[in-house]
């Protein structure tokens, strides 16, 4: 059987606060638990939801949570069902409401000496106790002329007189808390001798030098007095006017007229009515001088045909608030249609090319008028004047590809080469009209080019193929001076390209034929075994039908390549001694020797007194110092080749002889002794 371990119990709860109805069950098998409220299943909400088997309330609601709750446990397999005891909330609450007139039925029926009953519509549970206030002052029960009925929440004034006039409010408190009336009641019982407002002055905005009129009227029995004051409390009468209100006139009916208004007249004007009895009534009105500021500038706008666009006109600051309207071609825009004004906005629906032009936003008030133009361009899709054409461009010369289009606004043109955007550099230049210039055409410029012309309305594109007309040229040009090693095999290459594959041949510059051991194999001059006689001037000639021939002159030198007779050795020298690094090279032409020390060439003219290079190439360093240590490279070179060899130099401190060592003891390492 299903057994309840914990059952829900009835309890006090506070409106809007948390609460929990507990329910715990024990059963032989699994059960599912649900809750009923007045017999209907409870649906989970964020406010009220099942928490395990219990029912949790995040905020108790006196309307939704009133009724009987019951916890039901069901074994869905067997169908067995058990129900808990019923539980309900005693919800404590208090809710504000207005003060209303209960008697008489309407305010119009309130007369002096009648009974007036007000009701305080604050409700709650438990029933709260009520406190009444007139003009913020508490009314205690039992005072003369009024009674308070807490049960009916009423305040009765009998009889009601002018002294009862005022703002009535109420507050109530209970165990739950406190609330005060959400809307208060103003009781106004006229005393004929009290001044009453008939006509109150209104704030006025006038343009400079215009006139302003304030109306003010009171009534009472006997008739009340009326007085006008300006800001500084100076009375204004037709007999005594303040210096800055010389043009003020007070009429018999109480109206005040100000003519030729100046900035110093702006401010607060007070109209004071005083009856035979009762307090003075002070009414205020402000005189403002009309003003209007300048309008901000519009940025030119570019729109596309067929779209809908809006341009907002921010009205300038001004008093009174300036009115705003749009004009086009001197005609005010309507408030509906295709091109119209909506609020402060200019609306262009389904834009046409003909809508382009200058639109003017006008703003005006009493102080004047301001205007600002906005230039609207209706963008069109570019059209072709001249598309790029498939072109043959000559190598080495400038080449041009046209992309001439027209549109509004002026279209922007970009070029692509093999689908890659061309950025302007020393080789490419895009002219203002869209033409692409290739400054010096190269063979690999032969490819596809595409130009795209765009405006905000859209873009067009076209492509053209460039074929480069190759010039007849050596690729690469042969070196004008070349060396061949004596008694060795040698080759001198010569190759060329052109629009047609050129034929290449070699000849001696003097026109004599090549010896039999020298062959010309498809442009490569081949020497089986170089002799001294092979030296001299040779010409490589490349030719084809359409482009003629080109020549390259080469001076061949026969040389014995450089070898070192003496190479510098690894050397260690005592500090302050002299180091000698020997180097001797041979070859034809006779090689020159240069030294490099510590990664810089040692210039013989700037060596200073400690260093010297001999004719035979040896390097001597006197009075060596530790900073002279390092690698020294001997470089031998002539007009045909260059060779180098290197050795390290170590500079060490001279050891102090120990007593055990004789004066003739050898040094601990190989030294140059000087």
């Amino acid at each position: 059987a299903i057994v309840f371990i914990k059952q829900p119990s009835s309890q006090d709860a506070l409106q809007g606060r948390r609460a929990l109805l507990r329910c715990e069950v024990e059963a032989p098998g699994p059960v599912h638990v649900y809750w009923l409220l007045d017999g209907a299943p409870v649906q989970d909400t964020e406010r009220r939801f099942a928490q395990g088997s219990s029912l949790s309330f995040a905020a108790v609601d006196r309307l939704q949570d009133s009724g009987t709750f019951q916890c039901v446990a069901r074994d869905d397999v067997t169908g067995e069902e058990a129900r808990s005891a019923n539980a309900s909330f005693n919800i404590k609450w208090i809710e504000a409401g207005p003060v209303v007139l209960k008697h008489p039925a309407s305010e119009a029926e309130i007369q002096p000496q009648t009974q007036v009953t007000l009701r305080c519509h604050i409700d709650g549970h438990p029933r709260p106790t009520y406190q009444w206030f007139r003009d913020g002052t508490p009314l205690s029960d039992g005072q003369s002329n009024h009674t308070v009925s807490s049960k009916e929440r009423n305040l009765t004034l009998r009889p009601a007189g002018p002294e009862h006039s005022g703002l009535y409010s109420c507050c109530a408190h209970s165990a739950f808390g406190q609330a005060c009336s959400s809307q208060n009641f103003t009781l106004s019982i006229a005393d004929e001798s009290f001044a009453r407002v008939v006509l109150a002055p209104q704030d006025v905005v006038v343009a400079r030098y215009e006139e302003a009129m304030f109306h003010c009227q009171f009534s009472a029995q006997p008739p009340p007095s009326l007085q006008w004051l300006f800001e500084d409390e100076t009375p204004i009468t037709n007999r005594s006017r303040p210096p800055h209100l010389r043009r003020a006139t007070v009429f018999a009916n109480g109206s005040l007229l100000l003519t030729q208004v100046r900035p110093r007249n702006a401010g607060i004007y007070r109209c004071i009515g005083q009856g035979q009895r009762g307090p003075p009534i002070i009414l205020e009105a402000t005189l403002h001088l009309a003003e209007i500021e300048d309008m901000p500038l519009f940025e030119p706008r570019v729109f596309t045909a067929g779209s809908e666009e809006r341009v907002t006109c921010l009205p300038p600051k001004g008093l009174p608030e300036p009115s705003v309207w749009w004009e086009h071609a001197g005609v005010r825009l309507p408030t509906h249609g295709r091109v119209y004004q909506k609020g402060h906005e200019l609306v262009l629906a389904n834009i046409a090319e003909s809508d382009a032009g200058v639109y003017t936003c006008h703003a005006a008030n009493l102080a004047g008028q301001r205007r600002q133009d906005v230039n609207i361009t209706v963008a069109t899709v570019p059209s072709w004047l001249k598309k790029p054409q498939d072109s043959q461009l000559e190598e080495g010369k400038p080449g041009y590809l046209d992309c001439l289009t027209q549109a509004t606004p002026k279209p922007t043109v970009v070029w692509y080469r093999n689908q890659m955007l061309i950025s302007e550099d020393s080789r490419f230049e895009v002219f203002k009209n869209g033409t692409l210039r290739i400054n010096s055409v190269e063979v690999y410029d032969g490819t596809w080019y595409r130009c795209m012309s765009s405006t905000p309305a859209g873009s067009i594109e076209a492509q053209a193929r460039v074929q480069v007309l190759e010039k007849l040229k050596f690729t690469p040009p042969p070196q004008p001076q070349q060396c061949m090693e004596f008694d060795k095999e040698a080759t001198v290459p010569c190759s060329a390209t052109g629009r047609e594959k050129p034929t290449i041949k070699w000849e001696r510059a003097d026109g004599s034929s090549l010896p039999e051991w020298v062959t010309d194999n498809a442009g490569t001059l081949h020497f089986a075994r170089v002799t001294r006689d092979d030296a001299g001037n040779y010409t490589c000639i490349a030719s084809n039908g359409p482009q003629g021939q080109i020549r390259a002159h080469v001076q061949l030198t026969v040389a014995v390549f450089i070898t070192f007779k003496v190479e510098p050795e690894r050397t260690t020298v005592y500090q302050g001694h002299t180091a000698l690094l020997q180097c001797e090279a041979q070859g034809d032409p006779k090689p020159l020797i240069q030294w490099k020390g510590k990664d810089r060439i040692l210039d013989p003219t700037k060596l200073g007194p400690r260093m010297h290079i001999f004719q035979n190439g040896s390097l001597v360093i006197h009075d060596v110092a530790p900073e002279d240590s390092g690698r020294y490279t001997c470089i031998a070179g002539n007009s045909c080749n260059i060779k180098h060899t290197e050795a390290p130099l170590y500079v060490v401190d001279k050891p102090v002889p120990e007593e055990s060592e004789g004066p003739g003891s050898p040094p601990p390492y190989k030294m140059i002794q000087t």
């Epitope: 017999g39 067995e80 129900r83």
Partner: antibody
Framework: EVQLVESGGGLVQPGGSLRLSCTAS????????MNWVRQAPGKGLEWVGI???????YYASWAKGRFTISRDTSKNTVYLQMNSLRAEDTAVYFC??????WGQGTLVTVSS | EIVMTQSPSTLSASVGDRVIITCQSS????????LAWYQQKPGKAPKLLIY???NLASGVPSRFSGSGSGAEFTLTISSLQPDDFATYYC??????????FGQGTKLTVL
């Protein structure tokens, strides 16, 4: 022995009414829930409604208005009152206690 | 209106096969677990297999198992036996004492 026996099925004309009974033995209806489920020929199971231990009833949306579940605890019997019957109400009607205990079913045929 | 969708509607399998039937509800079941599976053979009343999503009813072989939560559930038969060829139904319970069945899955011999 705990068991359920349905009765009251038979042939009824369209627009007619029929009351099915489900007599329980071996347990009390006052602390159990009872379901009615139907199955049209060759079709799937369709839940009709439930009566809980307190006698409150709940129905499938299609059954509301035409079908009424009630009980008589003194006779330990649950009823299914069916009004304004249509051809598509032809089915075997089962009563079931919870999920486990089912009756053998009774056939209702609605035909002219 | 609550809709429970079983898939597949029909399923052919062989003895020894592992079979999975899914049941999807248009809204979450009560407590995310109030779901049962039934087996029905022609001319018989349905027989309870699984209750509260994954609990095995008494006398039901352990090759039957259930899983899932909220609105998606599965019935698994780990190794199909000759006696298992039948029609299977899922049934969900919902807030407000409302119940609904799936349209059924007919399991036949391949």
């Amino acid at each position: 022995e705990v068991q359920l026996v349905e009765s009251g099925g038979g042939l009824v004309q369209p627009g007619g009414s029929l009351r099915l009974s489900c007599t329980a033995s071996g347990f009390s209806l006052s602390n159990h829930v009872m379901n009615w489920v139907r199955q049209a020929p060759g079709k799937g199971l369709e839940w009709v409604g439930i009566i809980d231990s307190s006698g409150s009833t709940y129905y499938a949306s299609w059954a509301k208005g035409r079908f009424t579940i009630s009980r008589d605890t003194s006779k330990n019997t649950v009823y299914l009152q069916m009004n304004s019957l249509r051809a598509e109400d032809t089915a075997v009607y089962f009563c079931a206690r919870g999920l486990y205990l089912w009756g053998q079913g009774t056939l209702v045929t609605v035909s002219s | 209106e609550i809709v429970m969708t079983q898939s597949p509607s029909t399923l052919s399998a062989s003895v020894g096969d592992r079979v999975i039937i899914t049941c999807q509800s248009s809204q979450s079941v009560y407590n995310n677990n109030l779901l049962a599976w039934y087996q029905q053979k022609p001319g018989k009343a349905p027989k309870l297999l699984i209750y509260y999503t994954s609990n095995l009813a008494s006398g039901v072989p352990s090759r039957f198992s259930g899983s899932g939560s909220g609105a998606e559930f599965t019935l698994t038969i780990s190794s199909l036996q000759p006696d298992d060829f039948a029609t299977y139904y899922c049934q969900g319970g919902y807030n407000g004492n409302i119940y609904a069945f799936g349209q059924g899955t007919k399991l036949t011999v391949l």
